[in-house]
């Protein structure tokens, strides 16, 4: 077991791709969520609030992503065996304090049935 193992189903497979679910507390207002493959940053999403409670969503490393009030989903497509690895949701919480950086992760197993283009 890895330190910070996700206590929920982190990987959801569909159509030869995978949705990687990164949960965060619903009380969190401003944060940055990074998806790490091993130690490499694959994707990130930052949510901040400006004056008048205007919400800003930014990505420096863009992936197809989906934001809800307690999770960020990152989507990876065209799965192959090279995608098998440890993936981590690296969450930086800016608001409310205390500021903290937390890790949640799991191993993505790739099975033949989940590949996008199986050879018949």
């Amino acid at each position: 077991e890895i330190n910070g193992s996700a206590n929920y189903e982190m990987f959801i497979f569909h159509n030869g791709g995978v949705q990687i679910l990164c949960k965060y507390p619903d009380i969190v207002q401003q944060f940055k969520m990074q998806l790490l493959k091993g130690g490499q940053i694959l994707c990130d999403l930052t949510k901040t609030k400006g004056s008048g409670n205007t919400v800003s969503i930014k990505s420096l490393k863009f992936c197809h992503s989906q934001l809800s009030n307690n999770s960020v989903s990152f989507f990876l497509y065209n799965l192959d065996h090279s995608h098998a690895n440890y993936y981590f949701c690296n969450l930086s919480i800016f608001d409310p304090p205390p500021f903290k950086v937390t890790l949640t992760g799991g191993y993505l197993h790739i099975y033949e049935s989940q590949l996008c283009c199986q050879l018949k």
């Epitope: 910070g4 206590n7 949701c89 608001d95 304090p97 903290k100 949640t104």
Partner: antibody, heavy 121, light 112 residues
Framework: QLQLQESGPGLLKPSGTLSLTCAVS?????????WSWVRQPPGKGLEWIGE???????NYSPSLKSRVTISVDKSKNQFSLKLSSVTAADTAVYYC??????????????WGQGTLVTVSS | DIVMTQSPLSLPVTPGEPASISCRSS???????????LDWYLQKPGQSPQLLIY???NRASGVPDRFSGSGSGTDFTLKISRVEAEDVGVYYC?????????FGGGTKVEIK
Amino acid sequence: QLQLQESGPGLLKPSGTLSLTCAVSGGSISSSSWWSWVRQPPGKGLEWIGEIYHTGSTNYSPSLKSRVTISVDKSKNQFSLKLSSVTAADTAVYYCARGHYDILTGSFDPWGQGTLVTVSS
Amino acid sequence: DIVMTQSPLSLPVTPGEPASISCRSSQSLLHSNGYNYLDWYLQKPGQSPQLLIYLGSNRASGVPDRFSGSGSGTDFTLKISRVEAEDVGVYYCMQTLQTPLTFGGGTKVEIK
């Protein structure tokens, strides 16, 4: 009323692994709270060890990070602490506590009653 | 890490008299939302710590109104308007602005 109760061995040998559990009663561990461990060596002050959210997200004190693992078991409504390679310096009363976010801050309320762990050969 | 420094180390008090404890942080605990991220705890002899004050000046539920917290930025004070015998113990300040969460070294309040 939320209550926390620590349990685990009170005596350990050097180089062993400390394992403690904190049982949560009167409320759900899946609430919007971070669950922390804090320790207090005999006659000394308080030191924050780390915390976990019910999803499994963890955050540790840098000084202990290489030796600490905190995990959560939602089915048993409890969370646990493991501290590896212990020495006499890890002798302390270990407390579990809830980060009380419903008052806008990480304030600890309530605390467990604490359990004394002694490391000695 | 934010370093928290408390003074005095020990405080002999007379019941009915006021008492004051100081806490200083190595960096400002004032967040852009206007709150100071500082708590005060009391650890009575043989007991677990209990929350007295959160966000610098807010009394926790059930805490008598003789306890008050004040200050902003890096300098904070816990005041007891009239000390009672049950107030003896060690008082700790703690910053909750960022992790690692850090505590002051404690102030031991005892009856003269």
